[in-house]
């Protein structure tokens, strides 16, 4: 399986909300002994590998933001901890998973990574990740809503707040 990032760049005004999205692409094994662990974290475009280093998002670690469930199930974090930080991660049965960040500040700018681990009991872990950039802007040059740039082309889309 692979992870697709529909958008590689999100440019948002300060104070806006944004939902960063990743999509799990098949074939996805939904067997009894397969579990999926999904999470989010901040990182950097390192010399060795992008998304290798795992930094917190608003002081929440990737452990705090984790989702774990069988291949056919949906999951949602309703952690008070995450919501107190203006964050919510969610996943649906179609393979989409996301993190919503509320009331963006300039400090939220940076590289964000989604991580999916396919766990096969008594075998191994298969991990894949996706990366996307968030730029939070302020002042007269800031867009009125988030503008997202698709990973596959240079065309941009204007999206309303999450």
């Amino acid at each position: 399986f692979k992870v697709a990032t529909p958008y590689s760049l999100y440019v948002c005004p300060e104070g806006q909300n944004v939902t960063l999205t990743c999509r799990l692409l098949g074939p996805v094994d939904k067997g009894h002994d397969v579990t999926f662990y999904k999470t989010w974290y901040r990182s950097s475009r390192g010399e060795v590998q992008t998304c290798s280093e795992r930094r917190p998002i608003r002081n929440l670690t990737f452990q705090d933001l984790a989702l774990a469930h069988g291949g056919a199930q949906a999951a949602n974090t309703s952690h008070d901890l995450a919501q107190r930080h203006g964050l919510e991660s969610a996943s649906d049965a179609a393979g989409n998973f996301s993190i919503t960040m509320r009331n963006l500040t300039l400090l939220d700018s940076g590289l964000y990574c989604c991580l999916v681990v396919e766990i096969r009991a008594a075998a191994s872990e298969h991990r894949v990740h996706g990366a996307m950039e968030l730029q939070v802007q302020t002042g007269k040059d800031a867009p009125s809503n988030c503008v997202v740039y698709p990973s596959s082309s240079q065309d941009s889309e204007n999206i309303t707040a999450a």
Partner: antibody, heavy 117, light 107 residues
Framework: QVQLQESGPGLVKPSETLSLTCTVS????????WSWIRQPPGKGLEWIGY???????NYNPSLKSRVTISVDTSKSQFSLKLSSVTAADTAVYYC???????????WGQGTMVIVSS | EIVLTQSPATLSLSPGERATLSCRAS??????LAWYQQKPGQAPRLLIY???NRATGIPARFSGSGSGTDFTLTISSLEPEDFAVYYC?????????FGGGTKVEIK
Amino acid sequence: QVQLQESGPGLVKPSETLSLTCTVSGGSISSYYWSWIRQPPGKGLEWIGYIYYSGSTNYNPSLKSRVTISVDTSKSQFSLKLSSVTAADTAVYYCARDIPAFAFDIWGQGTMVIVSS
Amino acid sequence: EIVLTQSPATLSLSPGERATLSCRASQSVSYYLAWYQQKPGQAPRLLIYDAFNRATGIPARFSGSGSGTDFTLTISSLEPEDFAVYYCQQRINWPLTFGGGTKVEIK
């Protein structure tokens, strides 16, 4: 702050079953592997096995025929049973949180189990 | 089962010196390797994950490098509290295995 605490008898007779429990406090038992690792006196670390919060398990083949790990999410506990023990099973037994695609990031303080008649 | 071989078994150094610890895998583990520190009577403590990333709260004097089969843990300048046993651990497949450990002792 997640903390782990092992509990169980410190002395077990040969051929009997070693039983230990690990209590998870300060956080959720969901979304992680919960592992048992042991360390014989003066020796290195050996992974025994894990249970996922959903109940799926994975054991070290060297111990698989004798090991059972179970979880009670309502009590935030997971347990180890090791049957037919011998003196070679004398060790400090640790429970640990194991994050998928990461590492053992939180450990209990360990409990010494001696197998002797 | 992947076998991890650590060398040297014992490293005798003075505070302020540089420590270089090696871990070699019997087959490639990509960069899926962690390092732990263990002091007498204590549980191991995670230092490095994915070969070269420091865990939360670990001082910058600890660094990891390598990929494939050969890995190194470096302590740039030993502090008194760094004298301990260090273990590497792979997680590319199961069973998860640890190296035999390297003891860093005061010279």
